[in-house]
Every structure is written in structure tokens, then in C-alpha cells.
């Protein structure tokens, strides 16, 4: 499955309008640092196959699309940023989606790398967590921001192997 | 490989201006930030200050507040310290090294080589 | 600023000793606390991130404890390369501080 052009450059778009998410210094925020444990072995390619890595950034996006969604990140972040963001996601959804369906059928991938998405999950529901218990305060956002821009230019990295594969 | 390349060493007379240069390679310059370290002769680390190459916001130690500027070019992946006045006890070894912001990973874990500073008349 | 106080400034060992800096902070710093190890003529390298994390590379003699305000950096059997001076430093809040540093030389 070759993904469009236009899907890198999505890429970019999502990353810089996650910068332009900055409400306030991070500078003011380094005590609120904390370990996501981010599922770097789900993003180490040398036993993936295809479909498992599309399937795996395909729930990456899914994941980070639900997280920027709730009333919590529409009131902790600029909405017209987070219009964009959504309409960038969608994108990189739809086309994860061709994708996974060309590779190895809609029905089976999910099962096929369950592991693989209920890591991913969990590591989304630890950044839920976070912000439940820091009860969303700017600094803890923008905590959230930092590890969301670090995960998305890892999916980024594992896009960019796929396709020099092929 | 990541690497921090700093500038050479210089030799300036007081009230000269002064900019030395940190060059990042082998990582994504603008996802670190860039912290600027001064070890005076047989003395021990001082934390100057920090700039986040992304935007170029920074941060300054009270002590070197008004006394240097740290800036950044993201285009060039290079950070700058520079001096509008130089004082003799200005005198030192300058170091860069790369913070990862608020990401849970290792402070400073790769540091320049340093830039030795001399000012005397 | 939070300061940071390392203690000793200076202590003489030998090659096999079990060697304990200790570093306090003014105020609690979690586990936001770093040591660095620097030798003549080198830039610092980093050590022990996070109290007590292993940096990549370096030796298991290494290790590091602590949180809040007292922290512990310990080499379990000194070797001949680690004869040098130790710095701790905080990052939990800026201005980021240093300890003054501990010159481990040989007895």
C-alpha cells in the first residue's frame, strides 16, 4: 500500500499545529515531568510486518484524535488549533484505514495485533490518568503536548521506514 | 551520531563583544532544548541559562541575567551565547548540552567540547 | 534558587573502594536530581539521571539514591578511570543549579 504525499506533509501540518498549541512556557513546568512508559517496542520495526505497523499508527492517531477531543482539551487548548488538528487527523485516519484494508482485510487486523493496539491504548490511558490527576492544569497540558509531539514524530520515524521498504 | 559542536577558542581584550556557537547534529534540533554551562578556572559548573531552539524562548540564571544573551538559529540546528561587553572575569570554559524539554528522558546527556574564553588587556 | 550542597568537597580512595557521595537540596526536588563526572580538560558527562537511572554507557558500579532532598551517588568498586570530579545538579525547577563538586583522588 503506497500512502499518499499527501499524508507526509499531514504529518508536518499535525506536528506544527501541535507546537502552535503552547499556551504557556514549559519552562514553568519542569516538576510536572513524568514517565508515560511510551511503547518504544511497538515502534521498533526489525519484527514488524506492514499491516502490524499500519494497524499500530493507525490506533497511535485514533488514540491521539480521542485524547484531543474531550471538552477538557477544547477548554485547556485554542480551538481554531484543535479544528485543524482534527481535520489533519481525520486525514491520516482515512488513509491508515485504505491502507490497512488493502493489506490484510478490515476484519482480521485488529485481532491479528492485539498486543501491539492494547499497548497503545494503555499508554494513552496513562496520559488520561495523568491528567485526570493533575486535574488538567496548564502545566500538565503542556507535559501532554511535549510526549504527544515526541510519540507522533516516532509514528512519523515509523511511516518514514515503512515506506523506504517498499 | 548526536553531536554538539562548539566554536573555537577566543582571545578578547574587555568591553569587546563576543559570540560563540553550539551546532547540533544527529537529532531533531528544535525537539531538545539548548542549556549554556561556565566553568571559571579550576572552579566548578554554573548553569547560565536555556533556550528552547523551537522559538526561541529562554530562560537565564539570575546570576547571568543581563549579563549574556542566548539565542538560536533552528534553520542552522545552532545555538549562540554572546557578550555585548566582555570582563575580564568573563574568563572560562563554556559549554552547551541538550535538555529534552519536558520529555521523560535523560538531562543533559550530550554535551559541545566547550569554548574557551579569554578576556585580558 | 534551590541549592544544592555536596559533601565531601574532596575525599582520597583506593582502586576496589566503595566510594559514597552524598548531595542535599534546599528544598524538595523529587527525583528530578543528575551526576555528572567530569576529568581534566573534558567536558561533563552524565552519570545518573532521574536519582537514580543508569545513563546508556555507563558502567553498573555507577549507581545513585534518593528523593526529595537527599541523594546518594555510589561506585561499588572504584576503578582507576573513575578518579575525577562528581557534580550533582537539580532540574526540577530553573534556574537549574549545581553542586559545588567532590574531587575523588587517588589515596
Known amino acids: 500500500c503506497d500512502l499518499p504525499q499527501t499524508h507526509s506533509l499531514g504529518n508536518r501540518r499535525a506536528l506544527i499545529l501541535l507546537a502552535q498549541m503552547r499556551r504557556i512556557s514549559p519552562f514553568s513546568c519542569l516538576k510536572d515531568r513524568h514517565d508515560f512508559e511510551f511503547p518504544q517496542e511497538e515502534f521498533d520495526d526489525k519484527q514488524f510486518q506492514k499491516a502490524q505497523a499500519i494497524s499500530v499508527l493507525h490506533e497511535m492517531i485514533q488514540q491521539t484524535f480521542n485524547l484531543f477531543s474531550t471538552k477538557d482539551s477544547s477548554a485547556a487548548l485554542d480551538e481554531t488549533l484543535l479544528d485543524e488538528f482534527y481535520i489533519e487527523l481525520d486525514q491520516q485516519l482515512n488513509d491508515l484505514e485504505s491502507c490497512v484494508m488493502q493489506e490484510v482485510g478490515v476484519i482480521e487486523s485488529p485481532l491479528m495485533y492485539e498486543d501491539s493496539i492494547l499497548a497503545v491504548r494503555k499508554y494513552f490511558q496513562r496520559i488520561t490518568l495523568y491528567l485526570t490527576e493533575k486535574k488538567y492544569s496548564s502545566c500538565a497540558w503542556e507535559v501532554v503536548r511535549a510526549e504527544i509531539m515526541r510519540s507522533f514524530s516516532l509514528s512519523i520515524n515509523l511511516q518514514k521506514r515503512l515506506k523506504s521498504k517498499e | 551520531e548526536v553531536q554538539l559542536v562548539q566554536s573555537g577558542a577566543e582571545v578578547k581584550k574587555p568591553g569587546e563583544s563576543l559570540k560563540i556557537s553550539c551546532k547540533g547534529s544527529?537529532?531533531?534540533?528544535?525537539?531538545?532544548?539548548i542549556g549554556w554551562v561556565r566553568q571559571m578556572p579550576g572552579k566548578g559548573l554554573e548553569w547560565m541559562g536555556i533556550?528552547?531552539?523551537?522559538?526561541?524562548?529562554?530562560a537565564y540564571s539570575p546570576s547571568f541575567q543581563g549579563q549574556v544573551t542566548i539565542s538560536a538559529d533552528k534553520s542552522i540546528s545552532t545555538a549562540y551565547l554572546q557578550w555585548s561587553s566582555l570582563k575580564a572575569s568573563d574568563t572560562a570554559m563554556y559549554y552547551c548540552?541538550?535538555?529534552?524539554?519536558?520529555?521523560?528522558?535523560?538531562?543533559?546527556?550530550?554535551w559541545g567540547q566547550g569554548t574557551l574564553v579569554t578576556v585580558s588587556s | 534558587d534551590i541549592q544544592m550542597t555536596q559533601s565531601p568537597s574532596s575525599l582520597s580512595a583506593s582502586v576496589g573502594d566503595r566510594v559514597t557521595i552524598t548531595c542535599r537540596a534546599s528544598?524538595?526536588?523529587?527525583?528530578?536530581l543528575n551526576w555528572y563526572q567530569q576529568k581534566p580538560g573534558k567536558a561533563p558527562k552524565l552519570l545518573i539521571y532521574?536519582?537514580?537511572s543508569l545513563q546508556s554507557g555507563v558502567p553498573s558500579r555507577f549507581s545513585g539514591s534518593g528523593s526529595g532532598t537527599d541523594f546518594t551517588l555510589t561506585i561499588s568498586s572504584l576503578q582507576p578511570e573513575d578518579f575525577a570530579t562528581y557534580y550533582c545538579?537539580?532540574?526540577?525547577?530553573?534556574?537549574?543549579?549545581f553542586g559545588q563538586g567532590t574531587k575523588v583522588e587517588i589515596k
Open positions: 533556550i528552547d531552539p523551537s522559538d526561541s524562548d529562554t
Open positions: 544527529g537529532y531533531s534540533f528544535t525537539s531538545y532544548w
Open positions: 528544598q524538595s526536588i523529587s527525583k528530578f
Open positions: 548540552a541538550r535538555h529534552p524539554g519536558l520529555n521523560w528522558a535523560p538531562d543533559f546527556d550530550y
Open positions: 545538579q537539580q532540574s526540577n525547577t530553573l534556574p537549574f543549579t
Open positions: 532521574f536519582a537514580s
